[in-house]
């Protein structure tokens, strides 16, 4: 009888560790959760105050209404420029109006003075029509001046206060545009 | 690291159409921008499309009005839907990403169009 007595309360004591220790483990994940939790909002909070402090265009960009622009530090082909472009998620310069025209044109006077800028305008070879990257035609008052004579592929570039035309293969400069974040405060 | 997957190349008749699709995975966040290029036997590879994260758009002068490239941002997929399509459209197409960093490139597609 006392033996029977003695296994039960031995297997009571086992009971009893055993719930100790997934009460352990229990304040142990609480605890975690908890930590989690707070790391969590902590995340969320920063998130959000960066996104509330973010600027509508990335570092070293120019904002005009909705659009951003990097005018490049380094000279380029026009094909390798639409290229640096696409890995900063823009495409080259769309000139869309002459108030946008004459902001570009503005800016780059500030910045660089008189150089020459590949923009995102190409002549098709076999019209001769002039069209942006996406495929729209320009206004009539944002036509390249002068026709290049080159056998070659031609695209547009800004000097000045003009749009110009010249052989794609050529180096320049050139132009990005991206859409600028829209703020939701 | 991106890893992208081309589908939809074939043999079409010209004047018929085709849809590419290239469906990236991977680190899809750092994506930038993803495009289409192609090759033709003895000629260089060249940009066809491409498309930002933001839904800004470039072509190849001879594929304007006749190509168009999209997105489906959940997805992580861009597709290229070729219309008209004309015998010098007969190439390679290979997909292509941008991140800040780096340039991602798929294994190809073959596209042929016959006469």
């Known amino acids: 009888k006392l033996l029977q007595v003695s296994t039960i309360a031995m297997q009571q004591q086992e009971k009893l560790i055993q719930q100790e220790r997934a009460l352990l483990n229990f304040t142990e994940w609480k605890r975690s959760c908890a930590l989690q939790m707070k790391y969590c909002q902590a995340f969320m909070q920063n998130s959000l105050s960066s996104a509330h402090n973010s600027s509508p265009c990335p570092n070293n960009w120019i904002q005009n209404r909705e659009s951003c622009y990097y005018v490049s530090e380094i000279w380029s082909i026009w094909h390798t420029s639409q290229e640096n472009c696409l890995k900063e998620g823009s495409t080259l310069l769309q000139i869309e109006s002459k108030e946008e025209m004459d902001f570009i044109t503005g800016s780059l006077r500030k910045i660089k003075g008189s150089y020459d800028y590949w923009v995102g305008l190409s002549q098709d070879g076999h019209s001769g029509r002039w069209l942006w990257q996406d495929g729209s035609s320009p206004s009539p008052g944002l036509l390249p001046a002068e026709r290049s004579q080159s056998a070659n592929q031609v695209c547009g570039y800004v000097k000045s206060n003009s749009l110009l035309s010249s052989n794609c293969s050529t180096w320049k400069y050139f132009i990005c545009e991206k859409y600028a974040l829209r703020s939701s405060v | 690291q991106v890893q992208l997957q081309e589908s939809g190349g074939g043999l079409v008749q010209a004047g018929g159409s085709l849809r590419l699709s290239c469906a990236a995975s991977?680190?899809?966040?750092?994506?930038?921008?993803m495009g289409w290029y192609r090759q033709a036997p003895e000629k260089q590879r060249e940009l066809v499309a491409a498309?930002?994260?933001?839904?800004?758009?470039t072509y190849e002068d001879s594929v304007k009005g006749r190509f168009t490239i999209s997105r489906d941002g959940a997805q992580n997929t861009v597709y290229l839907q070729m219309d008209s399509l004309k015998p010098e459209d007969t190439a390679v197409y290979y997909c292509?990403?941008?991140?800040?960093?780096?340039?991602?490139w798929g294994k190809g597609t073959q596209v042929t169009v016959s006469s």
């Open positions: 292509k990403a941008w991140t800040a960093k780096d340039d991602y």
């Open positions: 498309i930002t994260t933001q839904g800004r758009t």
């Open positions: 991977g680190s899809v966040f750092s994506i930038n921008a």
